[in-house]
């Protein structure tokens, strides 16, 4: 069961896995959740009754029964990992800790104007896990305004001490706020021969890359495939680092693959969720249980529902045996990866899906797209919403996109003349406008947040957020779309679609069925040539055919320009403005979402 509250003055006895240092019990709980085996923890707060060397210790614990005996102890705070919970989990920690010095390897020291600037520096430095900043009031003159960037093997401090007039905090890479490049390429027949920080077994290079991404010290990796000549190294995943942050040594070697940590793009790709099945593959590890199951899918469900199960191997039933049920071996290891991977024994293996909730919901695969045609089918664009106004009568006003369970991203110009959020209704999971009746459920709007630099669509900043009164429960027909990564600024999107219920020509009416059109992106230089009377800024993005014919139009405003990249859909643009609709040499102009990621995160993550 999911227990979220913390137990004050309580200590769990026994079950210790390891001890780390965290600045708060709340963060100790996050560290426990992300640890492959931790189910419970005990944190020691700062207290006069407690030995200062034990302050801020976070003891990670495991138990076969999923609980441990409780003992009363002043200053101890205990709790359970969120592994047992079904809600979305994030490692993002924006808290600033006053008068705490988080110890680590101080590898970079520089002057910064503020703690925020120091945190930004840490977020944009490939090695930085956390920082300590000496404020203006720091007693030692030569240390004032000094920003120390730090890292450790675990990503958590090696110790935490009280120190007046300093503040500490963590890198915001896991909050999607890093400007570091996101290099998704996997390089075949390549070995990176830099320092290894760890090695694990993985079934393929993609899993190896995901493990690298959530390993605190891994910057890039090399994976030896199952065809690697040296049998003892097949399926070996080497997690690597270097001083420069880039591989210094690339060696051509067949059957090896190498790539980079996806830390800077982890909010828009699955990192923890290894959802594939590996046929004719056996994962070895500590056996948790052996149960009968009808299929490998059923075995994966059993593993996902068993909180301690990390991976499994399913051996299909021999004909007519055991009512056609095979054996499902539920397994675990110290690091969450198989201790060995064997091929050719007929097993089907995979991982728990319990960790998928640590990834952004937007990375979930949606059903295959219908090619051709202009009308969409149900569930094809599950992030698309229709925004209605009820004044003076109810009608479709604009499109919008679900980007979080309480947030819709749309265009600012949609709210011209809208006096109050009370007159707005957001309908999700809708294909046809005719489905919307008096009793159709909708989301009320609590708040309209328009970019404060917005004046008119043509001059940019045409972006707005709607905070919903209630949260969206994600289903196949209503789920979020990923925001583009700041590290993906140089990606060339080739599979982009504009969707909406808008006009099909300049003088028309709102369409009943959600329409879709595949539209190529146009460079800003090319777009500027087509709109000489306007300034096409880098905060805008253009799309359209030279000959015209396909475009967004009236009523599509605020809706998404959705682009598929590496199997994940990204909200690249918001339908904003254009000269007419689908005119020759007049591309549509969209708000360039990647340029507003900071603004979106600032508004949606505000406490």
């Amino acid at each position: 069961e999911c227990v979220t509250q913390l137990l004050k003055d309580t200590c769990f006895e026994g079950g210790d896995i390891t001890t780390v240092f965290t600045p708060s019990a709340k963060y100790c709980q996050v560290v426990c959740t992300y640890h492959p085996r931790c189910l419970l923890f005990t944190f020691t707060a700062e207290s006069p009754s407690e030995d200062p060397t034990r302050w801020f210790t976070c003891v990670l614990k495991d138990s076969v029964t999923e609980t441990l005996p409780r003992v009363n102890r002043t200053a101890a705070i205990s709790g359970y990992s969120f592994k047992q919970c079904s809600h979305q989990i994030s490692a993002c920690n924006k808290d600033i800790y006053v008068d705490l010095d988080m110890k680590g390897i101080n590898y970079n020291s520089s002057v910064a104007k503020s703690a925020q600037e120091c945190q930004e520096r840490c977020t944009d430095d490939v090695h930085c896990h956390f920082f300590t900043y000496a404020t203006r009031q720091f007693p030692s003159l030569e240390h004032r305004n000094i920003c120390l960037l730090k890292h450790t093997q675990t990503g958590t401090p090696t110790r935490i001490t009280k120190l007046d007039k300093v503040v500490s905090g963590f890198s915001l890479k896991s909050c999607a706020l890093s400007n570091l490049a996101c290099i998704r390429d996997i390089f075949p027949n390549t070995v990176f021969a830099d320092s290894n920080i760890d090695s694990v077994m993985a079934p393929d290079a993609f899993v190896c890359g995901r493990i690298c991404t959530h390993h605190p010290g891994c910057l890039f990796f090399t994976f030896f495939s199952q065809e690697w000549p040296k049998e003892s190294q097949r399926n070996l995943c080497l997690l690597k680092t270097s001083e420069s942050g880039l591989p210094s040594t690339r060696i051509k070697k067949s059957k090896a693959l190498s790539g980079f940590s996806l830390q800077s793009c982890r909010h828009s790709i699955p990192v923890f969720c290894h959802s594939s099945f590996y046929h004719d593959t056996d994962f070895l590890g500590e056996e948790l249980d052996i149960v009968a199951a009808k299929s490998h899918e059923a075995c994966q469900k059993l593993c996902t529902n068993a909180v301690r199960c990390q991976f499994f191997t399913y051996t299909p039933a021999q004909a007519s045996c055991n009512e056609g049920k095979g054996k499902c071996y539920l397994k675990l290891s110290s690091n969450g990866s198989p201790t060995k991977i064997l091929h050719g024994r007929g097993g089907i293996s995979g991982y728990t899906l319990r960790l998928c909730k640590m990834d952004n919901e937007c990375t979930t695969k949606i059903k295959p797209r219908i090619v051709g045609g202009t009308a969409s089918v149900r569930g094809e664009w599950p992030w698309q919403v229709t925004l209605h106004t009820t004044s003076p009568t109810q009608r479709h006003l604009c499109g919008g996109s679900i980007i979080g369970n309480q947030w819709i991203l749309t265009a600012a110009h949609c709210f011209y003349g809208v006096e109050s959020p009370k007159i707005l209704r957001v309908y999700s999971g809708i294909l046809n406008q005719s489905e919307i009746k008096e009793d159709t459920s909708f989301f009320g709007v609590q708040e309209i947040i328009i970019h404060d630099q917005y004046k008119m669509a043509e001059s940019g900043y045409d972006i707005a957020l709607l905070k919903l009164e209630t949260t969206v429960n994600y289903t196949d027909s209503q789920r979020p779309i990923c925001l583009p990564s700041k590290g993906d600024r140089n990606v060339i999107y080739t599979d982009c679609w504009v969707t909406g219920w808008g006009y099909r020509k300049l003088r028309d009416k709102i369409q009943n069925t959600l329409q879709k059109a595949k539209i190529p992106l146009v460079t800003n230089e090319e777009c500027q040539k087509r709109y000489r009377g306007h300034k096409i800024t880098h905060k805008m993005i253009c799309a359209g055919y030279r000959e015209g014919g396909k475009d967004a139009c009236k009523g599509d405003s605020g809706g998404p320009l959705s682009c598929k990249h590496n199997e994940v859909w990204h909200l690249v643009g918001i339908t904003s403005w254009g000269e007419g609709c689908a005119q020759r040499e007049r591309p549509g102009v969209y708000t360039n979402v990647v340029e507003y990621v900071d603004w979106i995160l600032e508004k949606t993550q505000a406490v």
Partner: nanobody, 126 residues
Framework: QVQLVESGGGLVQPGGSLRLSCTAS????????MAWYRQAPGNECELVST???????YYADSVKGRFTISRDNSKNTLYLQMNSLKPEDTAVYYC????????????????????WGQGTLVTVSS
């Protein structure tokens, strides 16, 4: 028990030459990718040169044009010919088999299937 035994280290003057050898036993030498690493006092372990099982070679920028790696599969031996030696080449030189990168900057810890020799000291000094 896999064994890698280095020899040929010693004291040499700047500009001088040395030839290091590494004799391997208890594994299939010709199928292995071999390498020389070095570790100077207080420094991290660094890759000097690699020769793959199919004869492909790699050299660190700092030794390019001065060092030559070679192997004699019939003798299960790896060589490193070091010319124009400089004081900054002073280090313990380690022979390694199927070891793609050092672990934690240390020339002794390996991952599955990777092996290290015990090292031979090269001192370049006048």
């Amino acid at each position: 028990q896999v064994q890698l035994v280095e020899s040929g280290g010693g004291l040499v003057q700047p500009g001088g030459s040395l030839r290091l050898s590494c004799t391997a036993s208890e594994f299939t030498f010709d199928d292995s990718d071999m390498a020389w690493y070095r570790q100077a006092p207080g420094n991290e372990c660094e890759l000097v040169s690699t020769i793959t099982s199919d004869g492909g070679t790699y050299y660190a920028d700092s030794v390019k044009g001065r060092f030559t790696i070679s192997r004699d599969n019939s003798k299960n031996t790896l060589y490193l010919q070091m010319n124009s030696l400089k004081p900054e080449d002073t280090a313990v030189y380690y022979c390694a088999a199927d070891q793609w990168g050092s672990a934690e900057g240390d020339c002794t810890s390996s991952y599955p299937g990777g092996y290290w020799g015990q090292g031979t000291l090269v001192t370049v000094s006048s």
